[in-house]
Interface confidence: low
């Protein structure tokens, strides 16, 4: 009769570092004691007529282990294949791009560490939770690596690495791990330079917008922008549409900047940069300032007009060209009557860069003269007839401007000036009319013919 | 912090001349202009001129007919006004201020100077 | 020169109350590079005078936002939403688009 030995449990699974407790026993009735062989620390538990029963600690590592017992003088052996499964210690995906250009292509790396059995442990490669790749895990450490073509659709997605420990034909179900989420950020930065639009000249203390613009730019609200005059850097607002970047920022040419100069627009995305870069010049121009020697003057006084501007400017006053560019241009006159109120207009123009600039300034001259009523328009003999409407149209000029009164000789009756007003058979005599200011007094005598209303 | 410190009170003789110092601080003194403004007693304020401290520009108001001038001593940064051929009328409050070239007024003041002319 | 006239003279309020200061240029204020360089100062009792408002509706730093500046060519105000008790002194327009730079002649903000 042959007798067996068995091994119990069969073929256990168990996970990396576990206890298992195992069992021997023989049907032969006259066994020796019962032995078992292994690698593993072992403990006799308990034993008895025919059995054994061990405790296997710190398991780590698959293993075989062997009961042998002598019976009738012949040794029966029994075995047990132990299999250990343990999950990954590290689940790393590598590090992605800071910036990765759409249309090219980009390498996702997985790295694991540890995980038993590898014949059970799969590698799978995610782009949010669309599976990439799926490879075994092989070396250890296993690294499993993807080829992706980069689009915008990946601006902003978490690729992540995932290990699938599957057990299930054990019974003990699917173990996953997952590496923290890597975010990727693609772009597109077109070869074409910026547009930028920008003065040609700008004068010293002045300002005026600068634009710079950039199409086709993904994602544009990353983009940085750097707009400068010269060294000086300037304070952009930047602005977003669609794939559109623009930034406009306010250029003030500061008098140590004076000359030729350089407006530049650097735009960059993704570690790249696209630059417009603009010829400025940076011009001086004061002036023109037109001066009077005496902006209010007395009739026969000699008034001096002059009339200037900054350096390389030409100015001409009242048709006169001054000498020289930079030169003062000068009139002198005899203040009269007639140049009351004269304006005196000089222009200024100064060349930059082949191209001329104007300006203009004019200043008004006032002269004082004494009151004058001017006869032609102030009838010395008047037939009017009674109660009719009529105007005294007499007029005075001077300057301050005088007051005019026409007053009855004799009587302290005064006619209203350039009013109408009905005339009636008192108003027959004769009238002082009198200019006055405060540079004298012009008198001029009217007489008034009223012919009496006949009824008949 | 910006600060402009002028000089002491002045008591001056009708015909004379007076100088005004203004030294600056808290920024660099060559990329700012520079003006003077002054205030009569109980009266608003008049522009007198103004200097750019890094040309030595200068900018006057033709009212004052040649009798102010405007000077700069960028080793010190320190800007000067001297009015001459001094009458009773000149009796003001004399003030700095500086201006950037944007935004183009008067962002600091000086504490002011008092000069009185007196017989 | 540009003659700036500033409208009151005096103007008594009462704290909390909305305050209104109107200046007015006798000639267009819009300088060839299009900006229009009016300006606005307050000067406190025995103080210089300080920066409010510049190039018409700009608040200098650290102005408070109950004071705005407004217009356009020729005509401005500047108006304050509550008066408080350090808003009290005299207020100044001041152009500097044309040489000579000129100033309002002043409206006095005090207590009614």
């Known amino acids: 009769q042959e007798f067996l030995l068995r091994v119990e449990p069969q073929n256990p699974v168990l996970s990396a570092g576990g206890s298992l407790f195992v069992n021997c026993s023989t049907d032969c009735p006259s066994s020796e004691k019962i032995a078992l062989e292994t690698s593993l620390s072992k403990e006799l538990v308990a034993s008895g007529m025919g059995w054994a029963a061990f405790n296997l600690s710190n398991v780590t590592g698959n293993s075989r282990i062997l009961c042998s017992v002598y019976c009738n003088g012949s040794q029966i052996t029994g075995s047990s294949n132990i299999t250990v499964y343990g999950l990954p210690e590290r689940v790393e995906l590598a590090p992605l791009p800071p910036w990765q250009p759409v249309g090219q292509n980009f390498t996702l790396r997985c790295q694991v560490e540890g995980g038993s059995p590898r014949t059970s442990l799969t590698v799978v490669l995610l782009r949010w939770e669309e599976e990439l790749s799926r490879q075994p895990a092989v070396e250890e450490p296993a690294e499993v690596t993807a080829t992706v073509l980069a689009s915008r659709d990946d601006h902003g997605a978490p690729f992540s690495c995932r290990t699938e420990l599957d057990m299930q034909p054990q019974g003990l179900g699917l173990f996953v791990n997952t590496s923290a989420p890597r975010q990727l950020r693609t772009f597109v930065l077109p070869v074409t330079p910026p547009r930028l639009v920008a003065p040609r000249f700008l004068e010293v203390e002045t300002s005026w917008p600068v634009d710079c613009t950039l199409d086709g730019l993904f994602p544009a609200s990353e983009a940085q922008v750097y707009l400068a005059l010269g060294d000086q850097m300037l304070n952009a607002t930047v602005m977003n549409h669609g794939d559109t970047l623009t930034a406009t920022a306010t250029a003030t040419a500061r008098a140590d900047q004076e000359g030729a100069r350089e407006i530049v627009c650097n735009v960059t995305l993704g570690g790249e940069r696209r630059e417009a870069r603009e010829n400025l010049t940076v011009f001086s121009f004061l002036g023109p300032i037109v001066n009077l020697s005496e902006p209010t003057a007395h009739e026969g006084s000699t008034v001096t007009v002059s009339c200037m501007a900054g350096a390389r400017v030409q100015v001409t006053l009242d048709g006169v060209p001054a000498a020289a560019p930079g030169q003062t241009a000068q009139l002198q006159l005899n203040a009269t009557e007639s140049d009351d109120g004269r304006s005196f207009f000089c222009s200024a123009t100064l060349e930059v860069d082949g191209e001329f600039l104007h300006r203009n300034s004019s200043v008004q001259l006032r002269v004082l003269y004494g009151p004058k009523i001017d006869r032609a328009t102030c009838p010395q003999h008047l037939k009017w007839k009674d109660k009719t409407r009529h105007v005294l149209q007499c007029q005075a000029r001077g300057n301050p401007y005088p007051e005019l009164r026409c007053l009855k000789e004799g009587s302290s009756r005064e006619v209203p000036v350039g009013i109408p007003f009905f005339v009636n058979v008192t108003h027959n005599g004769t009238y002082q009319c009198q200019a006055s200011s405060s540079r004298g007094k012009y008198t001029l005598v009217v007489v008034m013919d009223i012919e009496a209303f006949s009824s008949h | 912090q910006v600060q402009l410190v002028q000089s002491g009170a002045e008591v001056k003789k009708p015909g004379a001349s007076v100088k005004v110092s203004c030294k600056a601080s808290g920024y660099t003194f060559t990329d700012c202009i520079i003006l003077w403004v002054r205030q009569a007693p109980g009266q608003g304020l008049e522009w007198m001129g103004k200097?750019?401290?890094?040309?030595?520009?200068?900018t006057y108001n033709l009212k004052f007919k040649g009798r102010v001038t405007i000077t700069v001593d960028t080793s010190t940064s320190t800007a000067y006004m001297e009015l001459s051929s001094l009458r009773s009328e000149d009796t003001a409050v004399y003030y700095c201020?500086?201006?950037?070239?944007?935004?183009?007024?008067?962002?600091?003041w000086g504490q002011g100077t008092l000069v009185t002319v007196s017989s | 020169d540009a003659v700036m006239t500033q409208t009151p003279l005096s103007l008594p309020v009462s704290l909390g109350d909305q305050a209104s200061i109107s200046c007015r240029s006798s000639?267009?204020?819009?300088?060839?590079?299009?900006?229009?360089?009016l300006h606005w100062y307050l000067q406190k009792p025995g103080q210089s005078p300080q920066l409010l408002i510049y190039?018409?509706?700009n608040r200098f730093s650290g102005v408070p936002d109950r004071f705005s500046g407004s217009g356009s060519g020729t005509d401005f105000t500047l108006k304050l939403s509550r008066v408080e008790a350090e808003d009290l002194g005299v207020y100044f327009c001041s152009q500097s688009t044309h040489v000579p730079y000129t100033f309002g002649g002043g409206t006095k903000l005090e207590i009614k």
């Open positions: 000639q267009s204020l819009v300088h060839s590079n299009g900006d229009t360089y």
């Open positions: 200097i750019n401290p890094y040309f030595g520009t200068t």
């Open positions: 201020a500086r201006k950037e070239a944007y935004p183009d007024a008067m962002d600091y």
């Open positions: 190039k018409v509706s």
